[in-house]
């Protein structure tokens, strides 16, 4: 195996030493740890946690830990002013009240500092009109209003269900299509699974349950009032007229007892189909506004929260490497939370401290890593990913040059059923191999490895015999290191049955009730499945950090940037007389993924066979491995979106969380019909297929022979 | 050679619920439209919706919305029309065609009768 | 959309011409040149004639012609042969990927 070639290595220090060392008994008692309080961004007991780590980590054994901290943009309710909606008559009484705060979990009645649910980021305001039901507030939700229904949303305010898609993007549909305010909540439909009770009994969201969040369109900014450089001291910061993505209407968030007074009076229209209905005893009629006998009646949002620059605190440690240290190796992940973080981020924490005890203790035995492992908890991820989008940007000039690969370490698990991994095609082999070196932690595959419960349960659509490996999105940390720098990128946590489970999430996210209990009693009882989640994540730090030749297969690129062609032509081809009017030809691209193929064939032909006992082809070779991914960036970014730089994955421009292949091409595609004009519109299509088909043809000249 | 195959002919009594299909071969499926047509003994075509196999995008006519449902499997290159519940009046023949650049219909399938009586 | 118009039956002797008209609105025939005409003889799957106004695919005799004015289409049939009795229809795309039939013309060769 090539970990076992590293460094001062004796045959204890191997990664199966490491993987030994990680103990599931010791991940417990770190997320209860992590767990006893609120740790919000920007609040004491936050900064408080992020010295606790520090001082740990040192512990442990890493070479240097250091706090990295930024003045940001965050956002808090008025302690004096409590945010909520009303129902008011014509005389303008409220006359229903939603509620101020979820009732708290048994055991944490007493816990102070517990924000209410609110929305991150919602200006003030206290708009009041009719309500229009949009169902989740997608854009095709909005167009089917709009075209089809002809309903029209300006100057009303809109009620959506959380699920299906980020919830900015909800914000950014509404404010689009005129509406002065949102209301968000979540549907028994989408966060109570069938026959499981709600939290403390299950891990089903209760009715005064409510999911908080931000609602930001950062677009990978970072900081609203400093996009592109940390904010650091000396930072120019924007007014916040001109802060990046900051929404402009009013948004609260409710729970779905709340959300049954407001629905079960709706009127107007009738839902247009069966997908628009949840579960909630209510005709989930569109409007606008309530039906006959409540017509007069109107719905008010009374929102008082504030933003506020702020000081965040990443945590960064580091275990030097002994033959590469200028070679990075990034684990990272969050420690703030909205509240408890239970689950987000403290499953994820608390498997990230194990991973840096285990490292420290095999340092502490004499090892040492090849490359440079630096470790991060960062802050301020639920404001927008600050923390990690501030270091990064502080440190871009180092990471674009010295960065091999960066893992994110949030969640730990979102299910108990089986694994998920999102990452670049550079590192499918490496998931591949190392599942197949891991027991599965399943009932009924005891002694099998993760590699066949996992294939078992989450087959891949395309390849038998392979588990589905997904695009990477954003919503995580992970995003300005691959999206905006390019850095070979991945995740991995264990998730729920999606075939069975069609709520979005899991129920308790982002609400007070995301406790250890939760996690304890209801998830992973004996942490089998973080542990699990601990070995996938460490175990590919290990490769990574370790194995002489970088763990990457060019050629998986190759494959995925053919099956992205065929995807975005066969798009393009719904217009068949538009192609041929404009001339649009998806030759260039077909010939750039050819060329792409071929060279990738010869490069790990060429991988195979090289003399790794010299030190500077071994270093070309790996540098070339290394800076791939690096070459599927676009310095001038995303038409209206700059930081998002790769050219063949970008988060979805209608779900932040989701991946979309080739996103320039696809962007310039969608909806093209309704373009006012339509040579520019395919014009746009043109260029943007230029710039695919020049970026992956660069990308494949950079594996060719050197000379 | 491109080929657009029709199931076989059907008798069924209202309120039945049916599916009639439409399999095409000689040409990438998944990159052209489908459209389905309705002829009424007697009458002319009617356009019912139009489907693209690659994604299942669907586009009913306003007098078909909500009548009929459109789908299509790509993975075996067939195009379906259901109904949940016949009516006497959905007695027709119905065809199934490929449309191209230039907005054009350019092969057809054979069609099929769909008899609905009591 | 309304169904484009078209006169219910048009007739002439073999050798004769005989045109077929074809009006919509500015909303699809007479915006877009994107008009076609098919063939049914009875008992048959329709036949593409025509195409983009005057196209002709490979395999339809020459007779057969197409032309467009405002808004409306017509097709002739030049040199009428017997086996060209039949009905024809016309179709317009009106935008946004919606098509518009005609009503339909039949065809009587005396």
């Known amino acids: 195996k090539s970990s076992n070639e590293a460094t001062n290595i004796t045959p204890k220090h191997n990664m199966k030493a490491f993987l030994d060392e990680l103990k599931a008994e010791n991940i417990k008692k770190f997320l209860y740890n992590f767990t006893q309080i609120p740790h919000l961004a920007g609040t004491e007991q936050n900064f408080q946690l992020a010295k606790q780590i520090q001082s740990q980590w040192k512990e442990f054994g890493l070479d240097s830990v250091e706090l990295a901290h930024y003045d940001v943009l965050l956002s808090y309710p008025n302690k004096t002013h409590p945010n909520y909606i009303s129902i008011i008559n014509e005389d303008g009484n409220e006359i229903f009240n939603t509620s101020l705060f979820e009732p708290p979990p048994p055991g944490y009645e007493n816990v102070s500092d517990i924000v209410p649910p609110f929305s991150a980021f919602s200006p003030q305001g206290m708009p009041e009109g009719d309500l229009v039901y949009v169902n989740y507030a997608r854009t095709e939700d909005f167009f089917k209003l709009e075209r089809d229904m002809k309903i029209n949303c300006s100057g009303k305010i809109v009620i959506a269900r959380y699920g299906k898609v980020f919830r900015g993007n909800k914000v950014k549909n509404a404010q689009l299509a005129g509406a002065k305010g949102v209301i968000l909540y979540s549907d028994p439909a989408d966060y109570f699974a069938p026959g499981v009770k709600s939290y403390p009994d299950g891990w089903n969201l209760p009715g005064g349950g409510v999911q908080r969040g931000n609602i930001l369109n950062l677009n990978g900014a970072g900081d609203p009032l400093t996009p592109g450089y940390p904010a650091n001291e000396y930072a120019y910061r924007r007014g916040i007229a001109e802060a990046v993505g900051l929404p402009s209407i009013p948004v609260h968030p409710i729970g779905y007892y709340d959300a049954q007074k407001l629905l079960e009076k709706m009127g107007g229209s009738a839902p247009p189909d069966s997908s628009w209905r949840g579960s909630l005893k209510v005709p989930y009629n569109v409007g606008p506004g309530f039906t006959g006998n409540f017509s007069t009646q109107k719905v008010k949002m009374h929102i008082h929260s504030t933003n506020e620059v702020t000081r965040i605190y990443n945590v960064i440690g580091t275990l030097r490497g002994a033959v590469e240290p200028d070679r990075y190796v990034i684990l990272g992940g969050h420690r703030d939370s909205w509240v408890f973080g239970g689950i987000d981020p403290q499953s994820g924490a608390a498997v990230v401290h194990e991973i840096v005890r285990s490292f420290g203790t095999l340092k502490k035995e004499g090892w040492r890593p090849r490359r440079t492992i630096l470790f991060a908890s960062w802050d301020a991820e639920e404001f927008g990913l600050l923390g990690s989008t501030e270091w990064a940007e502080e440190n871009s000039r180092l990471l674009q040059e010295r960065g091999v690969a960066y893992i994110n370490a949030d969640s730990s698990i979102e299910g108990n059923y089986t694994l998920r991994v999102d990452c670049t095609p550079l590192m499918y082999s490496l998931v591949h191999n190392l599942t197949k070196e891991l027991k599965s932690p399943d009932e009924g595959f005891e002694g099998k490895s993760l590699y066949e419960s996992w294939t078992k349960k989450s087959p891949s659509p395309e390849f038998s015999g392979m588990p589905r490996i997904s695009k990477l999105g954003s919503g995580n940390d992970f995003e300005v290191f691959f999206q905006r720098l390019g850095i070979a990128s991945g995740r991995a946590r264990y998730t729920k049955n999606w075939e069975t489970n069609k709520f979005s999430g899991y129920p308790l996210y982002h609400s007070v009730y995301e406790t250890y209990e939760l996690v304890e009693k209801f998830y992973d009882p004996m942490f089998k499945y973080h542990l699990t989640v601990a070995q996938v994540r460490g175990g590919m730090v290990f490769e990574l950090a370790n194995s002489i030749v970088l763990p990457f297969d060019c050629r998986d690129y190759a494959v995925v940037l053919r099956k992205y062609a065929d995807k975005i032509y066969s798009i393009s081809m719904k217009h068949p007389q538009e192609m041929k009017t404009y001339s649009v030809s998806f030759d260039s691209l077909f010939s750039a993924v050819k060329n792409f193929t071929e060279i990738a064939s010869k490069f790990s032909e060429r991988l195979q066979d090289f003399d790794k006992s010299n030190p500077i082809v071994l270093r070309m070779m790996n540098d070339q491995l290394m800076f791939l991914e690096r070459a599927f960036i676009d310095p001038l970014g995303l038409p209206d979106r700059p930081f998002y730089r790769h050219v063949i994955y970008a988060p979805s421009s209608h779900n932040k969380y989701a991946g979309e292949s080739f996103p320039g091409i696809y962007d310039a595609l969608f909806d093209i019909e309704s373009k006012v004009d339509p040579s520019k519109a395919w014009g746009e299509v043109k260029r943007q297929i230029y710039v695919a088909a020049f970026t992956v043809q660069a990308a494949a000249e950079t594996l060719s022979e050197v000379a | 050679e491109v080929q657009l195959v029709q199931s076989g002919a059907e008798v069924k009594k209202p309120g039945e619920s049916l599916k009639i299909s439409c399999k095409a071969s000689?040409?990438?499926?998944?990159?052209?439209?489908i459209g389905w047509v309705r002829q009424m003994p007697g009458k002319g075509l009617e356009l019912m919706g139009i489907i693209y196999p690659y994604d299942s995008d669907t586009r009913y006519s306003p007098s078909f919305q909500g009548q009929v449902t459109i789908s299509a499997d790509k993975s075996i290159n067939t195009a379906y029309l259901q109904w949940s519940s016949l009516k006497a009046s959905d007695t027709a023949m119905y065809y199934c065609a490929r449309i191209t650049g230039g907005y054009l219909f350019d092969y057809w399938g054979q069609g099929i009768l769909v008899t609905v009586s009591s | 959309q309304s169904a484009l118009t078209q006169p219910p039956s048009a007739s002439g002797s073999p050798g004769q011409s005989v045109t077929i008209s074809c009006t919509g609105t500015?909303?699809?025939?007479?915006?877009?040149?994107?008009v076609s005409w098919y063939q049914q003889h009875p008992g048959k799957a329709p036949k593409l004639m025509i195409y983009?106004?005057?196209k002709r695919p490979s395999g339809v005799p020459d007779r057969f012609s197409g032309s467009k004015s405002g808004n409306t289409a017509s097709l002739t049939v030049s040199g009428l042969q017997a086996e060209d009795e039949a009905d024809y229809y016309c179709t317009s795309y009106a935008g946004s990927n919606k098509y518009v039939f005609g009503t339909g013309t039949k065809v009587t060769v005396l």
């Open positions: 500015s909303s699809d025939v007479g915006g877009y040149n994107y």
């Open positions: 983009e106004v005057t």
């Open positions: 000689g040409y990438s499926f998944t990159t052209y439209w």
